[in-house]
C-alpha cells in the first residue's frame, strides 16, 4: 500500500496538535496527483498540481482539523477517504510492582499522560545478572520473557515462578500510532513483598475470665506455606469507642489478650509480614469483634470483688483519656499466661 497503516482502525491517520501532518490517499498508487476535500465540503483543499502527489500537507493541525478527508484522482474517481485523529505520543508510563507471596509478583501501570489515541502496552522482564560474566554468553535462563498481561484486569501483568533472591528488570512500553515510550523498573521480590491480610479472624470470649479474649486466624490463602517462608503477625485491639489501638506481636496463629476492658466489645485486627522482615506489613484484616465474658467463675470470685466496679470505672476513665489499654494491677487468681509478664507480676504482688 502507498500509505503505511499505523496500527489502529483502518482508514484512520494520526497527528499531533500544533504540528504539521501529512495525510496519504489510500486508494491510489504512490505519486498519483489527487485533489483533496473535507468530507461534505466541495471547497478544494489541495489541487493535483501541488507537486505532492497523493499526499496532503496540513501545516499546523488543531482540533478543528480532525475529521474525514476525501481524495480524488484527475478523472474524478474517488481515491478514498481518510480520517484524521489528533493526540499525543506516549509519555513514560508509571509502573509499580507488588508481590503477595514469595514466588510470584505482578506489575501495574498507568499512562504518564492521556494520549487520546488507541494505546497498547508491551510488557516484558528479565533477570538481572551480576557483572563479571563477560566470558560467557548470556544464559537463556535470564530472559527476556514476556510478562503475560492479565486478561481480567487491564494494565496488569504477572510474573510466575520468580526467584526470591534475584533482581528483575521490568519493561513496560506504551505504544500508540505516534510513537512509543518505555519505563524500566528494577524489582527485588524481597523488597516488594506484601502479603495479603490474614484470613478467618475470630475473636471469642474466655469463659470465666472477664478481661480476656482469644483471637485466632489463618494464613492468607495466597501464601503458599513452606518451612522456609513463614509469616509473622501483628495484632491490634481496642475497646469500642476507643480511638487508640494496643499492639502485640503474637507467636503463631492465636493470641490470648489479657487486658481487655471487662464488659466492653473490642475490635481486633491482624496483619502479616515475612518472618525475616522482607518487604512490608500487609494491610490489616477486616476487624472482628468480641466481648469478654461477664463475671468470674463462681469459685473464683475473690473477697475484694466488691471494689471491682470502682476499678472498672478507673480503667474506663483511663481509656477516655486516650491512654492505651493497660493491664489492671489488681490481684487476680487466674492461671498464668507465659506470654503476659504483667499478669504474672500482678499475681506475685
Amino acid at each position: 500500500s502507498p500509505c503505511p497503516q499505523a496500527w489502529g482502525p483502518p482508514g484512520v491517520q494520526y497527528g499531533q496538535p500544533g504540528r504539521p501532518v501529512m495525510l496519504c490517499c489510500p486508494g491510489v498508487s504512490a505519486g498519483t496527483p489527487v485533489s483533496w476535500f473535507r468530507d461534505g465540503d466541495s471547497r478544494l483543499l489541495q489541487g493535483p498540481d501541488s507537486g505532492l502527489g497523493h499526499r496532503l500537507v496540513l501545516a499546523q493541525v488543531d482540533s478543528p482539523d480532525e475529521g474525514t478527508y476525501v481524495c480524488q484522482t484527475l478523472d474524478g474517481v474517488s481515491g478514498g477517504m481518510v480520517t484524521l485523529k489528533l493526540g499525543f505520543p506516549p509519555a513514560r508510563p508509571e509502573v509499580s510492582c507488588q508481590a503477595v507471596d514469595y514466588e510470584n509478583f505482578s506489575c501495574t501501570w498507568s499512562p504518564g499522560q492521556v494520549s487520546g489515541l488507541p494505546t497498547r502496552y508491551l510488557t516484558s522482564y528479565r533477570k538481572k545478572t551480576l557483572p563479571g560474566a563477560e566470558s560467557q554468553r548470556e544464559s537463556p535462563s535470564t530472559g527476556p520473557w514476556p510478562c503475560p498481561q492479565d486478561p481480567l484486569e487491564a494494565s496488569r501483568c504477572v510474573v510466575h515462578g520468580a526467584e526470591f533472591w534475584s533482581e528483575y528488570r521490568i519493561n513496560v512500553t506504551e505504544v500508540n500510532p505516534l510513537g512509543a515510550s518505555t519505563c524500566l523498573l528494577d524489582v527485588r521480590l524481597q523488597s516488594i513483598l506484601r502479603p495479603d491480610p490474614p484470613q478467618g479472624l475470630r475473636v471469642e470470649s474466655v469463659p470465666g475470665y472477664p478481661r480476656r479474649l482469644h483471637a485466632s486466624w489463618t494464613y492468607p490463602a495466597s501464601w503458599r506455606r513452606q518451612p522456609h517462608f513463614l509469616l509473622k503477625f501483628r495484632l491490634q485491639y481496642r475497646p469500642a469507642q476507643h480511638p487508640a489501638w494496643s499492639t502485640v506481636e503474637p507467636i503463631g496463629l492465636e493470641e490470648v489478650i489479657t487486658d481487655t476492658v471487662a464488659g466492653l466489645p473490642h475490635a481486633v485486627r491482624v496483619s502479616a509480614r515475612d518472618f525475616l522482615d522482607a518487604g512490608t506489613w500487609s494491610a490489616w484484616s477486616p476487624e472482628a469483634w468480641g466481648t469478654p465474658s461477664t463475671g468470674l467463675l463462681q469459685d473464683e470470685i475473690p473477697d475484694w470483688s466488691q471494689g471491682h466496679g470502682q476499678q472498672l470505672e478507673a480503667v474506663v476513665a483511663q481509656e477516655d483519656s486516650l491512654a492505651p489499654a493497660r493491664p489492671s494491677l489488681q490481684p487476680d487468681p487466674r492461671p498464668l499466661d507465659h506470654r503476659d509478664p504483667l499478669e504474672q507480676v500482678a499475681v506475685l504482688a
Partner: antibody, heavy 126, light 112 residues
Framework: EVQLLESGGGLVQPGGSLRLSCAAS????????MGWVRQAPGKGLEWVSY????????GYADSVKGRFTISRDNSKNTLYLQMHSLRAEDTAVYYC???????????????????WGQGTMVTVSS | QSALTQPPSASGSPGQSVAISCTGT?????????VSWYQQHPGKAPKLLIY???KRPSGVPDRFSGSKAGNTASLTVSGLQAEDEADYYC???????????FGTGTKVTVLG
C-alpha cells in the same frame, strides 16, 4: 561470548566528522544501557556519552555536548557515536561499554560499565 | 562535571596493602551509591573491579574491596601481587544529564 566491537575510527581533519559503531553480541542488547568512554594518549579515562536501552534518553559530557550524538539500533545490536566539529583534543581511543544500570520508580541511574570493547583510535589532525 | 580526585600514584611491596582514595562531591560520590572502580593495564581496555561501592563482580579476587565515607570512596588492594601493577580509576554517577564521571586515575606500582 559477550562481546563489544568498535569500528569507524581513523584520521580526520579538525572540523570534520566521524561516525563510530559498536557491534554487540552474546547478550540481549536492547535491555542494556550503553556508553562511550574515551582516553587521550597518556591520559585518563573520560566519560563521553550514555544512552538508555530504548534510546529515549541520553547524556553527554560537557566537553562534547552539542557536537556528539549517541544513538542505537536495537534491531541491529549496534551502538553509534556521531561526532561533528572535531577538535584536536578529541583525539583518543574511544571505548564502547555496557552498563546494566539501576532503575527505580522515579528514574534510572548509571551504575558501572561491566563489559568493554577493545577501543578504536580517533585522530584529529591537519 | 569535574573529574573525581585520586592520588596520582601509590605503591607497596608484594603482600602489603595499598589504599586509593577517590574524592568527589555530594552531587556524585556522596549523593549516590553508584561508585565503581576499574583496573587498566597498559594497552588494554579497563576492567570492572568494584561496583555499587562495595560489590565485587564474579571473577574478581576478594583482595579487592571498596568502601565509602561521605564524599570519598576508597579502593583497597590487600596482599599485593605483581599483576596488580596497573592504573586504577574510580567512577560515579554524576547526578545531572544522566551523566557519569571518572576519577583522575592512580598508578599503582608493586615494589621489588
Amino acid at each position: 561470548e559477550v562481546q563489544l566491537l568498535e569500528s569507524g575510527g581513523g584520521l580526520v581533519q579538525p572540523g570534520g566528522s566521524l561516525r563510530l559503531s559498536c557491534a554487540a553480541s552474546g547478550f540481549t542488547f536492547s535491555w542494556y544501557f550503553m556508553g562511550w568512554v574515551r582516553q587521550a594518549p597518556g591520559k585518563g579515562l573520560e566519560w563521553v556519552s550514555y544512552i538508555y536501552p530504548s534510546g529515549g534518553s541520553t547524556g553527554y559530557a560537557d566537553s562534547v555536548k552539542g557536537r556528539f550524538t549517541i544513538s542505537r539500533d536495537n534491531s541491529k545490536n549496534t551502538l553509534y557515536l556521531q561526532m561533528h566539529s572535531l577538535r584536536a583534543e578529541d583525539t583518543a581511543v574511544y571505548y564502547c561499554a555496557r552498563d546494566e544500570g539501576y532503575c527505580s520508580s522515579t528514574s534510572c541511574y548509571f551504575d558501572a560499565f561491566d563489559i568493554w570493547g577493545q577501543g578504536t583510535m580517533v585522530t584529529v589532525s591537519s | 562535571q569535574s573529574a573525581l580526585t585520586q592520588p596520582p600514584s601509590a605503591s607497596g611491596s608484594p603482600g602489603q596493602s595499598v589504599a586509593i582514595s577517590c574524592t568527589g562531591t555530594s552531587s556524585d560520590v556522596g549523593g549516590y551509591n553508584f561508585v565503581s572502580w576499574y583496573q587498566q593495564h597498559p594497552g588494554k581496555a579497563p576492567k570492572l573491579l568494584i561496583y555499587e561501592v562495595t560489590k565485587r563482580p564474579s571473577g574478581v579476587p576478594d583482595r579487592f574491596s571498596g568502601s565509602k565515607a561521605g564524599n570519598t570512596a576508597s579502593l583497597t588492594v590487600s596482599g599485593l601481587q605483581a599483576e596488580d601493577e596497573a592504573d586504577y580509576y574510580c567512577s560515579s554517577y554524576g547526578g545531572s544529564n544522566n551523566a557519569g564521571v571518572f576519577g583522575t586515575g592512580t598508578k599503582v606500582t608493586v615494589l621489588g
